[in-house]
Amino acid sequence: LRPSRVHNSEENTMRALTLKDILNGTFSYKTFFPNWISGQEYLHQSADNNIVLYNIETGQSYTILSNRTMKSVNASNYGLSPDRQFVYLESDYSKLWRYSYTATYYIYDLSNGEFVRGNELPRPIQYLCWSPVGSKLAYVYQNNIYLKQRPGDPPFQITFNGRENKIFNGIPDWVYEEEMLPTKYALWWSPNGKFLAYAEFNDKDIPVIAYSYYGDEQYPRTINIPYPKAGAKNPVVRIFIIDTTYPAYVGPQEVPVPAMIASSDYYFSWLTWVTDERVCLQWLKRVQNVSVLSICDFREDWQTWDCPKTQEHIEESRTGWAGGFFVSRPVFSYDAISYYKIFSDKDGYKHIHYIKDTVENAIQITSGKWEAINIFRVTQDSLFYSSNEFEEYPGRRNIYRISIGSYPPSKKCVTCHLRKERCQYYTASFSDYAKYYALVCYGPGIPISTLHDGRTDQEIKILEENKELENALKNIQLPKEEIKKLEVDEITLWYKMILPPQFDRSKKYPLLIQVYGGPCSQSVRSVFAVNWISYLASKEGMVIALVDGRGTAFQGDKLLYAVYRKLGVYEVEDQITAVRKFIEMGFIDEKRIAIWGWSYGGYVSSLALASGTGLFKCGIAVAPVSSWEYYASVYTERFMGLPTKDDNLEHYKNSTVMARAEYFRNVDYLLIHGTADDNVHFQNSAQIAKALVNAQVDFQAMWYSDQNHGLSGLSTNHLYTHMTHFLKQCFSLSD
C-alpha cells in the first residue's frame, strides 16, 4: 500500500487539456501510407527528408534521392517515374480549391544525378503526372494539356482551346472538383500508357460568383469563379482519348455519350481504364437518380472508340439518388469485362455485386443489415473490402478478404481481432498484386500503421505506432468516450458522448451538441481524436454529443434516403429528439444546452436553434448554408431536385434559415464566416444577418477576412478562442 499523500501527488501530475494544446497540434498523430512502386517495394519520405526505397523481402532500404537534392529546389513533394529513371520534384505549392493547386516542377535524372536541362517545364503547372509505364509526362498548363515522350523532349500540345474560367482541359472546374470527381485532375492514362483520356469542361454559360479579396492593396481584387448554383446552367463535359505514341496522327477522339444520358442535362462521373484498348465511363443524369456505366472499345480500323448499347449498365434509385455520396466505381476482374461494384441490394443496403453481363443478373457477393464501404483490390483469387459488419457498429471499419477463386466464396475478417480495443477503424493500401499491404488504424485508440503479408495476412512490421504521442498523453486527463444507440420510433440514432474525466452521473453537466448531419455523412465513428471538443470536456467540464440521424450513411437506404427532397427537416428533428433523450439520462443541466456546427452542420445548428423548442440556450454556426438556392447545383440537386415550380421550389423556400429569423429571438446565436469562402459563399451568412437585423433580433457575428471555408492559419486560433469564450459565457463558466 502506498501512502495517500504519494497517490495524491501522482494524481496531481495529471493535467487537463488546454486550448493551447489543441491549437498547437500538440497531440496530433501520424499515419504511414507506403508509396508502392512494385509488389515488394515502396518509397517513403524520411523524417530528415530523404526519399528512401524499402524492399520488404530483403528488409533493406536505399536512399534514392537525398534531402540535399530536395532542398536545392525547395521541393515539398516528388514522383518517381515508373521506369525509375527520373523523379519530378514539386515546389512553390500554391493552393487553389479543395484539391487543386499549382506548382513548379523540376525533373531530376537519376542515371546521371543531374536536373534535366533544355525543354524545361513551364510554370506554374496545374497538374503533372508520369505515364504508368516508362517516363512519358502529361501536364496541364494554362488549361491546356501537353505531352512529353521523355522529360528532355519538346512538348506536344494536345489541346488548344483552354481558357481561364471558360474551358478546362485535363483539370476539373470548381464544381466537378468539389462535388463530382472529386480530384484535382481530369485525365487518365491507359494501363500501359498507350492512350491518354481527358475531360474538357466548358463553363462559358455558367453564372459567376464574384467576391472581394482584400489583400493589402489599395483596392481589393475580385475573385471570379464559374459556380453553378442550384438550377443554374451547368458545365458541359466531353471526354476525349488520344494515342500518345502518335498523338498527331488522328488527334483526340471523342468518346460518345450514351443516348439515354445525352437526351437532357448530364454529368460525367468517372473514367476507369480496363485495358489499353478498353475503357469504362460513368455518366449521370442531372436529376441524379439514373447512372449509366458504359464500356467502350478501341476500333483499330476507324481509330475511334465504340460504346455498344449492350455494354451499357444502368443503375437507378427509386427511393433517393443514385449511389451514396458518389456513384461507386467499378473494380474490374482479370477477364477485363466483368466487374465488382457496390450498390443497394433489394433490402436497401449497399453491398458488393459481381456484374458479368447485365446489372439485372448481378451476383450479390456480400449481404446483411450492414454496408460494404470500399473495394480495395481484386486479385485472381481474393477480393479485399471494408465494411461496418463487425459487432453491428456502423461507425467501425474492418478489412475483409473474400476468396473468389473457390466456391462457395469464403470470407475472413483480416482486422477484427488484431488489436481489438485499440483498433476498430481501418483503411488499407495494397502493393501490386496485393503481395503486401499496409493497414492504417485510426482508432479508437492511438493510431497505428502496420505492414502485412498479402498471402498469409501476417504482420511483418510496425510502420508507425505514435510512441511520442502515447508518451505525451500519459499525464493528460483525457475525456471518456462512449458510442451507444437510441431507439426512437423505429429509427436507430447512434451517438458518441464525450464525458469529462471525473464524470459523475449524479451531477449535472452542460451539454454541447456537435452536428454535421449532411446526407451520406457519418459523425459517430470509432476514431481517435484530441481536438477542441476533447478540451471542452477535459478542462471545461462539458458533455459533448454527436448524433447520426436520418440522412446519414452506412446504415441502409431507409435512413439515408429519408431526407431526399426534404433537407433541413429530419436532420434537425433527430438532433432535438436525441437531446431530449440525453436530458432523460439525468446528468444534463437542461438550462445549459448548446449546439454548434460547421458548413452543413452550421445549417443544422441554425435550424435547431430556430426550432422554437426552447431546448437550446445558445449555439454557433460556422460557414453555414442558409438557403439551398445559394449552394452548388451538383450537390444540392442530388438531394433536393430542382428549385423550379414544377419540381421542388416550395421546399427550397421553406428550408431556409432566413425564414426562421423570428425564432432566434430567444437564443444566443454566434454566426461566423470567411469572406473568401469559395464553397459556401459569404452570401449565406450575409443573408442570415440581414434577416436577423430586419427582424430586429440580436445576435453575435464574426467574419474572417480573406479566409475560405476552412478558416485556416491564424484564423483557426482566433476562431476557437472566440467560440470558447462564447460557450463559457453561455454556460456561465468562469474564465
Epitope: D83, R84, Q85
Partner: nanobody, 123 residues
Framework: QVQLQESGGGLVEAEGSLRLSCAAS????????MGWFRQAPGKERELVAA???????LYAGSVKGRFTISKDNAKNTVYLQMNSLKPEDTAVYYC?????????????????WGQGTQVTVSS
C-alpha cells in the same frame, strides 16, 4: 545478351577490405545498369549497390559509407570496394546487369547474372 564473371571473393577478417570485380562481355556495356547482390544462407538475395549507365549510384543502408561501386566502361568491368567488413557481410556476391534504370532492388528486375563469388568475413 550479357555474360558476367565475378572475381575477388575470399576470406577476410572483420574490419578488413576486399575488392570484387565483374567482367562483362558485350559491346553495349556502357548502356547497362550494373548491380551487386548478395545472398547469405537462408536469406533472400538482396541488392547491395548499383550503378546506372550515367554513373549515379545506389547503396543499401547497411553498407552505405563502407562499400563503393564503380565501373570502367573501357574495361567493361564493374567493381565493388568493400571496407570495414563485418561478419554479417558474409554471403555469396553476385554481379547483375539490366538495361534501363539502376534503381531496382528486386532480384526479378535484373535479367543478367554472374555465377557468384563467396565472401567470408571472420570475427
Amino acid at each position: 545478351q550479357v555474360q558476367l564473371q565475378e572475381s575477388g571473393g575470399g576470406l577476410v577478417e572483420a574490419e578488413g577490405s576486399l575488392r570484387l570485380s565483374c567482367a562483362a562481355s558485350g559491346r553495349t556495356f556502357g548502356s547497362y545498369a550494373m548491380g551487386w547482390f548478395r545472398q547469405a544462407p537462408g536469406k533472400e538475395r538482396e541488392l547491395v549497390a548499383a550503378i546506372s549507365s550515367g554513373g549515379s549510384t545506389l547503396y543499401a543502408g547497411s553498407v552505405k559509407g563502407r562499400f563503393t561501386i564503380s565501373k570502367d566502361n573501357a574495361k567493361n568491368t564493374v567493381y565493388l570496394q568493400m571496407n570495414s567488413l563485418k561478419p554479417e557481410d558474409t554471403a555469396v556476391y553476385y554481379c547483375a546487369a539490366r538495361s534501363g534504370g539502376a534503381y531496382y532492388t528486386a532480384r526479378v528486375d535484373w535479367p543478367y547474372w554472374g555465377q557468384g563469388t563467396q565472401v567470408t568475413v571472420s570475427s
